[in-house]
Interface confidence: medium
């Protein structure tokens, strides 16, 4: 991967296909690396990240990490090569439509991550399919 | 290393009133929300209050509104409970406990050693 | 508010055995249950949050399962420490819900 903003253009010289043997493009993602979040007990945020970038490589896909210790939440939004390990973790999930967090064990430090492979998916993250719609406010001042 | 430390239990009168705190280590309390959580003796668990991690919202469990009143400072990294017309039902040890926020979870973690209130003439 | 209610409320067993606890909600709270553990006089320690996550520092014995109104608990070979009382309880809505306790006994 590469910042976002450095201008992207594509490697004409690695044509990549898909298992249909179509040219492969490469992905549009949401890329602002780490920003702080205000994401927090919810069914699903937005990225609030304003950068659309065309991934470097025709194989990258999408990824958001989300992270929250005692000072603060980060949301990270970048590429990356699903062949290869993101914070020390095989992306799983890439082939997903939808950027799903699944928990990872960090000490020190909730840490989800998701990937996934339609275009800007990882603007849309999303924690639980089903969640709580009763009294949410009440709960943040139980458990928040 | 988290420690929470209940005091202020003991003995009371019916219709008499007393004040838990709970001091707290070894994490940044203004980033949690907190609360009581009692048991009776020989009982199971029964949450009772909780106080938003800024102080700015409560929430109390039915039997004990207009009775209760939690509350915390961020400076002193001490919570606290008011207990007023305090009933032989309310007879327990109470906890405090640490609450934890995460999309798609919510728990209690970790407790103090808690402290034991008696309402009895 | 939502009721959870867990069996059996004792069981006696063996060092070795393979425990099991259920725990059933009056409606659905998802995946929103977590599972304690008490010994007397002392505080409840957090094992398993979100009904399949194990708490950092908990035995790999532990291990949760369930959705929706039913969850389960397993000590896959019970040890000497585990017996105490064991709790599950809703964070699905307020207010926050508890099991009546599952007391495990030595046979």
């Known amino acids: 991967t590469i910042p976002p903003h450095v201008q992207k253009s594509v490697n004409n010289d690695m044509i990549v296909t898909d298992n249909n043997g179509a040219v492969k493009f490469p992905q549009l993602c949401k890329f602002c690396d780490v920003r702080f979040s205000t994401c927090d007990n919810q069914k699903s945020c937005m990225s609030n990240c304003s950068i659309t970038s065309a991934c470097e490589k025709p194989q990258e896909v999408c990824v958001a990490v989300w992270r929250k210790n005692d000072e603060n939440i980060t949301l990270e939004t970048v590429c990356h090569d699903p062949k290869l390990p993101y914070h020390d973790f095989i992306l799983e999930d890439a082939a997903s439509p939808k950027c799903i967090m699944k928990e990872k064990k960090k000490p020190g430090e909730t840490f989800f991550m998701c990937s996934c492979s339609s275009d800007e998916c990882n603007d849309n993250i999303i924690f639980s399919e089903e969640y709580n719609t009763s009294n949410p406010d009440l709960l943040l001042v139980i458990f928040q | 290393q988290v420690q929470l430390v209940e005091s202020g239990g003991g003995l009371v009168q019916p219709g008499g009133s007393l004040r838990l705190s709970c001091a707290v280590s070894g994490f940044t309390f203004r980033r949690y929300a907190m609360s009581w959580v009692r048991q009776a003796p020989g009982k199971g668990l029964e949450w009772v209050s909780a106080i938003s991690a800024s102080g700015d919202r409560t929430h109390n469990t039915d039997s004990v509104k207009g009775r209760f009143s939690i509350s915390r400072d961020n400076s002193k990294n001490t919570l606290y409970l008011q207990m007023n017309s305090l009933r032989a039902e309310d007879t327990a040890v109470y906890f405090c406990?640490?609450?934890?926020?995460?999309?798609?979870?919510?728990?209690?973690?970790?407790w103090g050693q808690g402290t034991l209130v008696t309402v009895s003439s | 508010d939502i009721q959870m209610t867990q069996s059996p409320s004792s069981l006696s067993a063996s060092v070795g055995d393979r425990v099991t606890i259920t725990c059933r909600a009056s409606q659905s709270i998802s995946s929103y249950l977590n599972w304690y553990q008490q010994k007397p006089g002392k505080a409840p320690k957090l094992l398993i949050y979100a009904a399949s996550s194990l708490q950092s520092g908990v035995p790999s014995r532990f291990s949760g399962s369930g959705s929706g109104t039913d969850f389960t608990l397993t000590i896959s070979s019970l040890q000497p420490e585990d017996f105490a009382t064991y709790y599950c309880q809703q964070s699905y809505s307020t207010p926050p819900t508890f099991g009546q306790g599952t007391k495990v006994e030595i046979k």
């Open positions: 406990a640490k609450g934890i926020a995460a999309s798609g979870k919510n728990y209690f973690d970790p």
